[in-house]
Interface confidence: low
């Protein structure tokens, strides 16, 4: 019968001829009366056999990532008779892995959106690197992820590549962050290869800012000839939030005279002071009203940011008109 061990050849061997092993018949007594032959893909070009001894050699540099095993056939012939000594047999040469491939992030560019003020531990995104080396061969393809840039706001789970928030962030201070993740094979041991990727993390807005009046005191004038419904001026608050989180509603907090009203221009987010009833310079030529401003939409969990609406004082001077 045939006698051989499992055949392995390391990839990327630079020698012109590398002995892999021996293939022989147990009928071979070593007197050179048998001839060994190699057949199949790679026979003669990649692998050769010593016809007399059955020793097999690799004569080309191999790349496991291109081809990890070769299936060949062996024959042994009695030189005297020309007959097969053993039935033709199939055997396998496995290309063994070396760590010659760095981890690669295949899905980049990575981009994620996470709400500002998200608590620690909130999942942002998972990044995954691939390593073309053999995952079953030692640690060549065993990866560890680490954060090169993004502390203290982000952390990465070393074995999964899951990025999480590690510190609360305020969109109003910074609305996006670039995080750089490194993947290292050989679980970080010497000889490890690495690859990096960038992740753009954008913070989406939450309503964590209340509107605040630009001025603590506004001064407006109204002619005593102005009809009711006249817009006599505008007041404005600012809100550091964006979009619907910055939409606001103005209202009168205090107007003992009940002479004025405030409506909200939802396009400009301004408060428009409206004359509700006619004024008379001779009766009163100066009014003070207090206005307040609140956000339009405030989720229950964010009410803590919206206690005590911002207020402003509006001094309104009535302009005299000569009466006939």
């Amino acid at each position: 019968g045939w006698v051989w061990n499992q055949f392995f050849v390391p990839e990327e061997m630079n020698t012109t001829s590398h002995h892999i092993g021996q293939l022989r018949s147990d009928l071979d007594n070593g007197n050179n009366s048998f001839q060994y032959k190699l057949l199949g893909a790679g026979a003669g070009s990649t692998f050769i056999i010593d016809e007399r001894t059955g020793d097999i050699y690799a004569i080309q540099k191999l790349d496991r990532e291109e081809r990890s095993l070769y299936i060949l056939r062996a024959q042994v012939i009695d030189i005297a008779t020309g007959r097969a000594v053993e039935p033709e047999s199939e055997f396998v040469i496995k290309v063994s892995d070396i760590n010659d491939n760095e981890p690669k992030f295949l899905d980049e560019p990575y981009e994620a959106i996470v709400p500002e003020m998200s608590p620690e531990g909130t999942l942002v995104i998972q990044v995954t690197a691939s390593d073309a080396d053999d995952p079953s061969s030692g640690n060549n393809a065993r990866l560890l992820y680490s954060l090169l840039q993004g502390q203290p706001y982000f952390s990465v789970e070393p074995t999964t590549g899951v990025i999480r928030i590690s510190s609360k962030m305020d969109r109003e201070l910074q609305d996006e962050y670039w995080v750089i993740i490194q993947a290292k094979d050989m679980i970080g041991q010497p000889g490890a290869l690495s690859g990096t990727t960038s992740v753009l993390i954008k913070l989406s807005d939450v309503n964590d800012n209340k509107p605040i009046f630009k001025e603590s005191l506004y001064r407006l004038t109204v002619s005593e000839s102005a009809p009711t419904g006249t817009s006599i001026g505008t007041i404005m608050a600012y809100d550091n939030d964006i979009g619907e989180n910055a939409e606001m509603d103005y209202s009168i907090e205090e107007d003992d005279s009940q002479t004025f009203d405030i409506i909200t221009n939802h396009e400009t987010q301004e408060g428009i002071v409206i004359l509700k009833k006619k004024v008379d310079f001779e009766h009163q030529n100066h009014y003070g009203i207090r206005a307040k401003v609140k956000n339009h939409h405030v989720p229950e969990q964010l009410m803590k940011y919206h206690t005590e609406a911002s207020t402003t004082f509006i001094k309104i001077q009535v302009e005299d008109v000569d009466e006939p």
Partner: antibody
Framework: QVQLVESGGGVVQPGRSLRLSCAAS????????MHWVRQAPGKGLEWVAV????????YYADSVKGRFTISRDTSKNTLYLQMNSLRAEDTAVYYC????????????WGQGTLVSVSS | EIVLTQSPGTLSLSPGERATLSCRAS???????LAWYHQRPGQAPRLLIY???SRAAGIPDRFSGSGSGTDFTLTISRLEPEDFAVYYC????????FGQGTKVEIK
């Protein structure tokens, strides 16, 4: 008649604090916005701060923002100016002034109190 | 802020003469929110004119104010001895600022 009397001025070292008072009489103090205005020696007038009639709103000149605090005690008919982190350039006569009820000009002024910031 | 520039810096006149003081604003003073004060040596300022042209209570009619937008004038028709003082304009259209003053002195 309307009277405004300032007090609390004096010589103070840079970085120190001082509180000025202005006692008001002869009018309904709680109905008027009140101001502090200063005048450096030989110089012009500089508006410093205003407080609304009810004390809920204050407004400051940029030169004193964050260092000075205007306040009022309606029960005592008194206006105050708390001056912290004083600098040499704060040296001046400090006047309290009443804002006209129907306007925003200053119709009554106190006689002033001198604050001298010097080491 | 609105900057007020007064001219001239000093006005040398005799009693009985007419004094014309100018105040120019760096931007339009809305609704003629401009006042004039005078200050005698060692005294507090005193309101003369508010709203650019309205005389304050107790102010003699020799004092008159005019102007709008960026140019304002205080006129003293006949100078009395007590009128020799420093005059300040003040805008209250946007916060409060004063001009640097015009000194009216006896010639």
């Amino acid at each position: 008649q309307v009277q405004l009397v300032e007090s609390g001025g004096g010589v103070v070292q840079p970085g120190r604090s001082l509180r000025l008072s202005c006692a008001a009489s002869g009018f309904t103090f709680s109905s008027y916005d009140m101001h502090w205005v200063r005048q450096a020696p030989g110089k012009g007038l500089e508006w410093v701060a205003v407080i609304s009639y009810d004390g809920t709103n204050e407004y400051y000149a940029d030169s004193v923002k964050g260092r000075f605090t205007i306040s009022r005690d309606t029960s005592k008919n008194t206006l105050y100016l708390q001056m912290n982190s004083l600098r040499a350039e704060d040296t001046a006569v400090y006047y309290c002034a009443r804002e006209r009820y129907f306007d925003w000009s200053f119709d009554y002024w106190g006689q002033g109190t001198l604050v001298s910031v010097s080491s | 802020e609105i900057v007020l520039t007064q001219s001239p810096g000093t006005l040398s006149l005799s009693p009985g003469e007419r004094a014309t003081l100018s105040c120019r604003a760096s931007q339009s003073v809305s609704n003629t929110y401009l006042a004039w004060y005078h200050q005698r040596p060692g005294q507090a300022p005193r309101l003369l004119i508010y709203g650019a042209s309205s005389r304050a209570a107790g102010i003699p009619d020799r004092f008159s104010g005019s102007g709008s937008g960026t140019d304002f004038t205080l006129t003293i028709s006949r100078l009395e001895p007590e009128d020799f003082a420093v005059y300040y304009c003040q805008q209250y259209s946007n916060s409060w600022t004063f001009g640097q003053g015009t000194k009216v002195e006896i010639k």
